[in-house]
């Protein structure tokens, strides 16, 4: 069979080889398409409800005024010339539709290095067959599931037209110290060959490099955290980040019910104040970061240096 590719909505003429150019003609067309069950016979003297889809022209050719998805299939003509010689024509018709130019929607203007980011969603509407969408970075194809690249795809079919809408959502994890203005684009490749790809306009998000978090420092006075009964301990939480984060305090792994403050004063230390203290700095952009833990202990008279371990207590400190 001869392969014919026709664009949806366009007319198509299939020649009946060996048919006399003018009536009377002895010929018949048989079609097996999405509009038929098994074979439908059309003859030159036909004329009827099928004319809107396919009709035999005076020269014996079959005319399809506007090819549709349902016209995909096999078309055969059997003709006899004036001398009684029989000729057969056999066509395999496939149809296609080129979509509009694909677009990137919901595109990000800024990406964060080192973490997964949604770059955008590429949308192509009105294709047949479905075809495929692919992403490019600086003109080179992006391979899903490689180097922090992931793609989520969706294909929908219009209930009336039968045409496809494709969606492809791109997620990337930009490398730290990489290109600060990468160029992303998306292209649609048709399901039928011989048609070139359609590419979107490129997008160029900025890549934001988060400043590496410096350690949260916890300073204890007196040094070592050992104090005589009734003495005072001052804990200071130092965070170099700007703007200053909120500081909360923990004792023995439990948050202390105190308002945020970078300094915690424990006056008139008693046994209930002994324990392990740490501070937690909460940044708006990074989440919580905890300091090292320090042990606060009471030196009984005659003892030197901090006692090992701690006794759990419920006393609360004072905030400076």
């Amino acid at each position: 069979a001869q392969n014919i590719t026709a664009r949806i909505g366009e007319p198509l003429v299939l020649k009946c080889k060996g048919a006399p150019k003018k009536p009377p003609q002895r010929l018949e067309w048989k079609l097996n398409t999405g509009r038929t069950e098994a074979w439908k016979v059309l003859s030159p003297q036909g004329g009827g409800p099928w004319d809107s889809v396919a009709r035999v022209l005076p020269n014996g050719s079959l005319f399809l005024p506007a090819v549709g998805i349902q016209d995909e299939g096999i078309f055969r003509c059997q003709a006899m010339n004036r001398n009684g010689k029989e000729t057969k024509s056999n066509y395999r018709v496939r149809v296609y539709q080129i979509p509009g130019k694909p677009e990137i929607v919901d595109s990000a203007s800024e990406l964060t290095a080192g973490v997964p980011n949604k770059v955008g969603t590429c949308v192509s509407e009105g294709s047949y067959p479905a075809g495929t969408l692919s992403w490019h970075l600086d003109g080179k194809p992006l391979v899903p599931n490689e180097k922090g690249v992931s793609v989520k795809e969706q294909t929908r079919r219009h209930p009336e037209t039968g045409l496809f809408t494709l969606q492809s959502e791109l997620m990337v994890t930009p490398a730290r110290g990489g290109d600060p203005r990468p160029t992303f684009s998306c292209s649609f490749s048709p399901g039928l060959p011989r048609h070139r790809a359609l590419r979107t306009a490129p997008i160029q998000p900025r890549v934001w490099e988060p400043v590496p978090l410096e350690e949260v420092q916890l300073v204890v006075e007196p040094e070592g955290g050992a104090v005589a009964p009734g003495g005072t301990v001052t804990l200071t939480c130092e965070v170099p980040a700007q703007p200053s984060p909120q500081i909360h305090w923990m004792k023995d792994g439990v948050p202390l019910p105190l308002p945020p403050s970078p300094v915690l004063i424990l006056p008139e230390i008693g046994p209930q104040d002994q324990g392990t203290y740490s501070c937690v700095a909460t940044h708006s952009s990074h989440g919580p970061q905890e300091s090292r833990a320090v042990s606060i202990s009471i030196i009984e008279p005659g003892e030197e240096g901090p006692t090992a371990g701690s006794v759990g207590g419920s006393g609360l400190g004072t905030l400076a």
Partner: antibody, heavy 119, light 107 residues
Framework: EVQLVESGGGLVQPGGSLRLSCAAS????????MTWVRQAPGKGLEWVAS????????YYPDSVKDRFTISRDNAKNSLYLQMNSLRAEDTAVYYC????????????WGQGTLVTVSS | DIQMTQSPSSLSASVGDRVTITCRAS??????VNWFQQKPGKAPRRLIY???NLADGVPSRFSGSRSGTDFTLTISSLQPEDFATYYC?????????FGGGTKVEIK
Amino acid sequence: EVQLVESGGGLVQPGGSLRLSCAASGFTFNNYWMTWVRQAPGKGLEWVASIDNSGDNTYYPDSVKDRFTISRDNAKNSLYLQMNSLRAEDTAVYYCARGGDITTGFDYWGQGTLVTVSS
Amino acid sequence: DIQMTQSPSSLSASVGDRVTITCRASQDVGIYVNWFQQKPGKAPRRLIYRATNLADGVPSRFSGSRSGTDFTLTISSLQPEDFATYYCLQYDAHPLTFGGGTKVEIK
């Protein structure tokens, strides 16, 4: 909303003529074949004529061929049926319907107009 | 010409009954059959197209089926508003032909 409104029916003597009209709205008229169907009093439905979307091709059953002519004016969204040499057996309610080819059959109908052929 | 032989020509049924109406084509018409409902003094209303497809706005109790050249309209549970006359139509070839109609009456 698709609407088809017939007009032009009435009483006519045998051998006389009548022209029916159908005003279409609510859809792209020139995308569809159009058809006239009739129904004699107390009887079933009978196909009368069809026309393709361009108006280039018309189709009739033998019972009305050479007497009836279907036409359309796509600029006016209107369908017509010119009926000549009318007979008593042409007495019926005449309906205008959208479609008539294999893509739809008939999907929408007008309310009908009565044609009475009698002396 | 293709004849569409519709049966029965009339039937009596009660609300809730399952009703089946058949049309037999005298030759192959493929899937190109409509079913219509008509109430007295009103225009026909399409129920089924291409033998088995339910038209927009038609209740799901109506269904169409095909076996070769036999076409069936089924009403799974007859409702009071379903008492009417039903017609089939073949639109595969000219002349387009309707079945003779089936009048569904209250028992």
